[in-house]
Amino acid sequence: HNTTVFQGVEGQSLQVSCPYDSMKHWGRRKAWCRQLGEKGPCQRVVSTHNLWLLSFLRRRNGSTAITDDTLGGTLTITLRNLQPHDAGFYQCQSLHGSEADTLRKVLVEVLADPLDHRDAGDLWVPGESESFEDAHVEH
């Protein structure tokens, strides 16, 4: 899996989308997890409704919410009030039994709020994201 980069501004919301084949993953719950280290486990943050038919209902864990369009095949994760500690590697997963198939690998980048003048001297204007192998950036 290639990694897709999603960039958000500190204090704002970031929406991450994970498209998938709706028939291939029919009946499967989904999850959003945070990768702990390069080879470490992916720690579950939030998962869709226990009843797959109700996957469209938004479920929340703290500032992270998840909802699944099971017919259209798009899993959407919303990170509210984005903070620097939210930056890192994540995965969208499709669950079956004790298995978790990776739908998409995600790198969340948190940009400084350009309207926040508290540290104007250190203001960094975001340019093109540093790319790594086959990275795809979405804002």
Partner: antibody, heavy 123, light 107 residues
Framework: EVQLVQSGAEVKKPGESLKISCKGS????????IAWVRQMPGKGLEWMGI????????RYSPSFQGQVTISADKSISTAYLQWSSLKASDTAVYFC????????????????WGQGTLVTVSS | DIQMTQSPSSVSASVGDRVTITCRAS??????LAWYQQKPGKAPKLLIY???SLQVGVPLRFSGSGSGTDFTLTISSLQPEDFATYYC?????????FGQGTKLEIK
Amino acid sequence: EVQLVQSGAEVKKPGESLKISCKGSGHSFTNYWIAWVRQMPGKGLEWMGIIYPGDSDTRYSPSFQGQVTISADKSISTAYLQWSSLKASDTAVYFCARQRTFYYDSSGYFDYWGQGTLVTVSS
Amino acid sequence: DIQMTQSPSSVSASVGDRVTITCRASQGISNWLAWYQQKPGKAPKLLIYAASSLQVGVPLRFSGSGSGTDFTLTISSLQPEDFATYYCQQADSFPRNFGQGTKLEIK
């Protein structure tokens, strides 16, 4: 009516290659996982592996990884099981089976099966 | 791999008898279990899925129960057409292994 029709019986010599087929009809073949199951003479069922014809995502049992290749051609609704070099121990009946999908559940259960293909490997 | 162990490996019974076959998983599989019936020279037939749900068209004399590691298939009143080999299969993870089978014979 959903059907999985397998290719006919084969008699081969050790070291020969072989590709058997499983053609689906009566359902959207692309959208169902297709598994292959081995049954050696007088023995039980052994799960070999599975493929999703939509994108050819394939999973193998460790017991069969590297021994066989599972593939599919969604344009003709057909899944394949192939060997590059057969052994006498490959003599068995091979079944293909469709993974059941219900309206609310993705399962690992098999609701439709092919009739089986008998492969005999003998010198 | 999750290993599936069936018992007994064979059982003799008469028409009208109640028969129970058990299946044990080497680790917990919740209710991700199926039961199949196979007759000589034929493909297996799905009887029970999700441990206890009856597949469409399967007679009500067949029932399944269990969760975690221990499961049972029960035939409440054996009919002549029920004499066959029965297999359990776990669907929790890959590879989706089968049990070794239980042959149900006429006494």
